[in-house]
Every structure is written in structure tokens, then in C-alpha cells.
């Protein structure tokens, strides 16, 4: 049994640093491997993350930790039984992967304007709490080339936008996704999308 | 109410092993590392050994490396200090003290919060 | 290792008046804000250590507030608003960051 593609992991900056790694070979990954983790530090102890499959070869490990600070060092180590198969360390400050915003809502009874709000995945005494940035993602369900990013580079989690922007009479999504350029991390996953129909009145034209 | 009680000093000759014991109750000993710190007649005070709360993690100081040894039984409760090889210069009293929250991820310090009434360690011939 | 220097070694005071010692470290005692590794003991006459401050400036349970621990990184003060006649001993710091944990001389503190 061999690691055929080395564990690289991301922390989320608050209570979880996700694991990936491949095998050269089909593998029941919860029963065969163990992957051990020790924060540098003084009288710390080694805790172990059961690994879950993540395709044939692939598997994943979801390591529980406390509130992570930028000194936080681990090491890792990845057992099969008693054969250590691969050790590395990882410093969760320099791999963050943000969670994902959540409660996006659109707005749609503010005088042509559509509104929509999320709300910031992270709580108020987390670091990152203030130093996330964000991108709307809003398409048309019936027209694919109908696709637009607006990138929200102010800290409230809303996106205002004149409803005339978007043609009216048909349905559209939205999703939003978080980065922090602070860190100068990956950005998260796109929040569950939400779907509204627009419409709005058109101006009356005068001849 | 948090109790720390050492036993097994005494007088012995250089050269000669001694076996401190130290009992605790009052928290919940298997979550927290403990400290052995001695303190010599009329001098200031010197940790001697620390030890994680699943016992997997264990420290010394240079002065008693490879000489003593360090152990819990958390059945019982007891945090152990074997001293061998023992010299005029281990003599102290040894006091045993509560350390931080081993078994969370990151350590949590609060500080030796709790100590031991102390035993007394004499090495001379 | 890391040298704990504690100053004065000696401190006499008058009942009332404030007091303050000095510790610094050879290396940062600093993890993340917050977390400095120092802490405070008293020790008085034919007693054990008894903790005052941990982490720099945290008070233990217990401990009356007029002791109070500052400082970051190398540089640490302990303050006695007024010191009253209990407060005889010796005060020493330590440092936990990193092992071997390590003291500093001790402060004889003594009433005028």
C-alpha cells in the first residue's frame, strides 16, 4: 500500500482542516488508514482523523481543531496499521479555504432595485470575519450566455442592483462565494443558489 | 475542592533510587498534564518534569535527563516520579502541580493553578 | 534554554504603597495575541508556590486585584497597587512556553 498523490489540506480558520489525498489503489479508507495530528506546542497531544473515501482511490480527513491562530503548526502523520506510509506537516494560516456566506435572499420589492444579502459564514471574534470579500454570481436559467459576476469588495455581505440590468419576465439564480485577501486565500464554495423571477416596469416612453 | 498530595521522599544515598508518588483528586486528572518542580534548600525553584494527560507527551530538564522518569496512572489517579542515580544535588523538596489541558487540540494554559504540600528529597551519605 | 532575569531581587516596601517587578525573557514569550507564556508565583515562608497571574496578565482564581500582570513578548511587569503585610515572599516568574520551563531568581519582597 502507497500514496500515490501526497495529503494537501485547507483550513476553513475556525474549526476544520480538510485532508485529500489518492492511493495507489482501491482503498476502504475508515478501515485501513489513520491519519495522526499534533500541534507543535507544548505538551500537546497526537488526535486522529478517521479518513472517509472519496472516490476508488481517494480519500478525505476532516480534522477537528480549536480556533486557529497564524503560529499553529501540525504535524501529520499517515498510518496504515503499523506502517507509516507518509508524514508532512501543515500550517492552517497559510492553506485557508473560507467557508461558504449563507442565507443568500433576494430581495425583490424595493423599487426596481433588486437586493440581496448573505450572511458572513464566520462569527464576529473570528479573524476572518472582517476580512472577507465576495462575488455574486447571477445567471438566467433560460439563457446560458446570460451570466454575470459582480465582485463585493466592501465587508457588508449585500449586492445592490437596478432590477433593468437583468431582463425582466424570466426566471434567474444567484450564488455567492468568500475570500480573504488578508491571507490570500482560495475562495470557498459557492452558497446553495436562490432562484426569483424578475420583472419590472418598464419606463413609460413619451412620444 | 482540588487536592495534590506527595509521598515517597526521604533520605537516601547517592546512587540510590527513590519513588515519588502524587495523588490527586478534585478535577479530572486524564484531561491535564502535570509538573513536578523541586526546590533545593534556601535556592529559587526548578521544574524538573512535565507530562501530558494521556502520558504520550513527556519533558525533563537536562539536570535529572536519563536519570528520572516520569509517569501517570490515570486509573489511580497518580502522577509517579522515579528518581535514579540519585545525587547531593537532587536534594530538594518536590512539589507536584496541575498543568494545563492536555487533550484539547491546542493545549489550554491556566497557569500551575494547583500545588502539592511538597516532599522532601535528601541524598547524602 | 530560555533566562528568566528578574529585578530587583530585593524589595523593600511600606505598607500601602505600590510595588512592581520586572521580568524579562532571553526569547519572545508570545504564541498569538493574547498568549503570552508567563505566569507570577508567590511563595511564602514554608509554603508551596502559589499562582498570582498566568499567560502575562491574567489574574488567578482567587488572587486580590490589586496584583496585576502586563507586558508581551520578552518584557513583563508585576504590580501591587498597595501592598499589605500578607503579601510578604518571594515572587517569582516562569515561563511555560517552551521546555525546559524556566524561573527566574525570585524577588524577596519584605515589609520596611
Known amino acids: 500500500m502507497k500514496v500515490l498523490q501526497e495529503p494537501t489540506c485547507v483550513s476553513d480558520y475556525m474549526s476544520i482542516s480538510t485532508c485529500e489525498w489518492k492511493m495507489n489503489g482501491p482503498t476502504n479508507c475508515s478501515t485501513e488508514l489513520r491519519l495522526l495530528y499534533q500541534l507543535v506546542f507544548l505538551l500537546s497531544e497526537a488526535h486522529t482523523c478517521i479518513p472517509e473515501n472519496n472516490g476508488g482511490a481517494g480519500c478525505v480527513c476532516h480534522l477537528l481543531m480549536d480556533d486557529v491562530v497564524s503560529a499553529d503548526n501540525y504535524t501529520l502523520d499517515l498510518w496504515a496499521g503499523q506502517q507509516l506510509l507518509w508524514k508532512g506537516s501543515f500550517k492552517p494560516s497559510e492553506h485557508v479555504k473560507p467557508r461558504a456566506p449563507g442565507n443568500l435572499t433576494v430581495h425583490t420589492n424595493v423599487s426596481d432595485t433588486l437586493l440581496l444579502t448573505w450572511s458572513n459564514p464566520y462569527p464576529p471574534d473570528n479573524y476572518l470575519y472582517n476580512h472577507l470579500t465576495y462575488a455574486v454570481n447571477i445567471w438566467s436559467e433560460n439563457d446560458p450566455a446570460d451570466f454575470r459576476i459582480y465582485n463585493v469588495t466592501y465587508l457588508e455581505p449585500s449586492l445592490r442592483i437596478a432590477a433593468s440590468t437583468l431582463k425582466s419576465g424570466i426566471s434567474y439564480r444567484a450564488r455567492v462565494r468568500a475570500w480573504a485577501q488578508c491571507y490570500n486565500t482560495t475562495w470557498s464554495e459557492w452558497s446553495p443558489s436562490t432562484k426569483w423571477h424578475n420583472s419590472y416596469r418598464e419606463p413609460f416612453e413619451q412620444h | 475542592e482540588v487536592q495534590l498530595v506527595e509521598s515517597g521522599g526521604g533520605l537516601v544515598q547517592p546512587g540510590g533510587s527513590l519513588r515519588l508518588s502524587c495523588a490527586v483528586s478534585g478535577f479530572t486528572f486524564s484531561s491535564y498534564a502535570m509538573s513536578w518542580v523541586r526546590q533545593a534548600p534556601g535556592k529559587g525553584l526548578e521544574w524538573v518534569s512535565s507530562?501530558?494527560?494521556?502520558?504520550?507527551?513527556?519533558y525533563y530538564a537536562d539536570s535529572v535527563k536519563g536519570r528520572f522518569t516520569i509517569s501517570r496512572d490515570n486509573s489511580k489517579n497518580t502522577v509517579y516520579l522515579q528518581m535514579n542515580s540519585l545525587r547531593a544535588e537532587d536534594t530538594a523538596v518536590y512539589y507536584c502541580a496541575k498543568d494545563r489541558i492536555s487533550i484539547t487540540i491546542r493545549p489550554r494554559y491556566f497557569g500551575l493553578d494547583f500545588w502539592g504540600q511538597g516532599t522532601t528529597v535528601t541524598v547524602s551519605s | 534554554d530560555i533566562v528568566m532575569t528578574q529585578s530587583p531581587l530585593s524589595l523593600p516596601v511600606t505598607p500601602g504603597e505600590p510595588a512592581s517587578i520586572s521580568c524579562r525573557s532571553s526569547?519572545?514569550?508570545?504564541?498569538?495575541?493574547?498568549?503570552?507564556?508567563l505566569d507570577w508565583y508567590l511563595q511564602k515562608s514554608g509554603q508551596s508556590p502559589q499562582l498570582l497571574i498566568y499567560?502575562?496578565?491574567n489574574r488567578a482564581s482567587g488572587v486580590p486585584d490589586r496584583f496585576s500582570g502586563s507586558g508581551s513578548g520578552t518584557d513583563f511587569t508585576l504590580k501591587i497597587s498597595r501592598v499589605e503585610a500578607e503579601d510578604v515572599g518571594f515572587y517569582y516568574c516562569m515561563q511555560s512556553f517552551k521546555a525546559p520551563y524556566t524561573f527566574g531568581q525570585g524577588t524577596k519582597l519584605e515589609i520596611k
Open positions: 507530562i501530558t494527560g494521556g502520558g504520550g507527551g513527556i
Open positions: 499567560l502575562g496578565s
Open positions: 526569547q519572545s514569550l508570545l504564541y498569538s495575541i493574547g498568549y503570552n507564556y
